[in-house]
C-alpha cells in the first residue's frame, strides 16, 4: 500500500498478503433470491442483471438453487468462504466455475456452488461430467 494510503487496524475490507499487497475484490452476480425457471438442465444462466463489487476482497461468488413443491428460486450473492452459508461450508470457493453440489435440506431440493472468477455465479453448472472429470 503506498504510504499516502492509510493502513487500518482490523479492517477486513482490505485484504493484504505478507508483503502488504492489496487484493482486488471479486465481481459477482448479486440479486439475492429470485424466482427461477432453471430446472432439469445441465447448466443455467442466473438472469441476474446486477454485477456487484463484493464488499470484502476475501469474498467469493455464491449461487444457491432451491426447489420445493411451490417454486424454484436462485440466489446469487457474495460471501466470505471462511463463514458457512445456509449452514454449509463453501468447500469449492477456489473453483473458477460454479459447479452445483446437492446439499441435504429437509422439504426441498437444495444445490449450492461457489467460485472465484469474475461473475462466475452467472453460469451455474449441474452437469455430473463437470463434477467428476472436468479439471477446471
Amino acid at each position: 500500500i503506498p504510504p499516502h494510503v492509510q493502513k487500518s487496524v482490523n479492517n477486513d475490507m482490505m485484504v493484504t498478503d505478507n508483503n502488504g499487497a492489496v487484493k482486488f475484490p471479486q465481481l459477482c452476480k448479486f440479486c439475492d433470491v429470485r424466482f427461477s425457471t432453471c430446472d432439469n438442465q445441465k447448466s443455467c444462466l442466473s438472469n441476474c442483471s446486477i454485477t456487484s463489487i463484493c464488499e470484502k476482497p476475501q469474498e467469493v461468488c455464491v449461487a444457491v438453487w432451491r426447489k420445493n413443491d411451490e417454486n424454484i428460486t436462485l440466489e446469487t450473492v457474495c460471501h466470505d468462504p471462511k463463514l458457512p452459508y445456509h449452514d454449509f461450508i463453501l468447500e469449492d470457493a477456489a473453483s473458477p466455475k460454479c459447479i452445483m453440489k446437492e446439499k441435504k435440506k429437509p422439504g426441498e431440493t437444495f444445490f449450492m456452488c461457489s467460485c472465484s472468477s469474475d461473475e462466475c455465479n452467472d453460469n451455474i453448472i449441474f452437469s455430473e461430467e463437470y463434477n467428476t472429470s472436468n479439471p477446471d
Partner: nanobody, 124 residues
Framework: EVQLLESGGGLVQPGGSLRLSCAAS???????RMWWVRQAPGKGLEWVS?????????YYARSVFGRFTISRDNSKNTLYLQMNSLRAEDTAVYYC?????????????????WGQGTLVTVSS
C-alpha cells in the same frame, strides 16, 4: 512514468453532487480496468466502482449503487466518478487505481497503481 492524478473533491452538503476526475498518463489506458476506491478516516479501503477498458461495462458496490456513475474517456485518458445524493458516510479520500486483466493483487507501495487521492467531505 505512470501517473494517476485525482481531482474534483471538496466540501458538499448531504444530498449534493460532485464529479471526480482521474487523469492517467504513462501507460496504455485502454488496457486497464479502472477503479475508484475510497478510504474513510481510520477505516479500510472500500472498492466503490470499476469500469472495463473497452465496452464500458461498469460495476458498483452496493453502498453506492444508483447514486454513483463511473465513466471513462479513453481519448483523454481520464476516468470519472459522478456522485449524486451524497451522504455523510461517503466522506473519504477517493483514489483511482488500475487493474490489468486477470490481476488479483496490487503490489505494496507502488505509486503506479494509485493516485494521491482527493478528499470528499459531506457535511452540513
Amino acid at each position: 512514468e505512470v501517473q494517476l492524478l485525482e481531482s474534483g473533491g471538496g466540501l458538499v452538503q448531504p444530498g449534493g453532487s460532485l464529479r471526480l476526475s482521474c487523469a492517467a498518463s504513462g501507460f496504455t489506458f485502454t488496457e486497464y480496468r479502472m477503479w475508484w476506491v475510497r478510504q474513510a478516516p481510520g477505516k479500510g479501503l472500500e472498492w466503490v466502482s470499476a469500469i472495463e477498458p473497452i465496452g464500458n461495462r461498469t460495476y458498483y458496490a452496493r453502498s453506492v449503487f444508483g447514486r454513483f456513475t463511473i465513466s471513462r474517456d479513453n481519448s483523454k485518458n481520464t476516468l470519472y466518478l459522478q456522485m449524486n445524493s451524497l451522504r455523510a458516510e461517503d466522506t473519504a479520500v477517493y483514489y483511482c487505481a488500475k487493474q490489468m486483466p486477470g490481476q488479483k493483487w496490487m503490489a505494496k507501495s507502488r505509486f503506479d497503481y494509485w493516485g494521491q487521492g482527493t478528499l470528499v467531505t459531506v457535511s452540513s
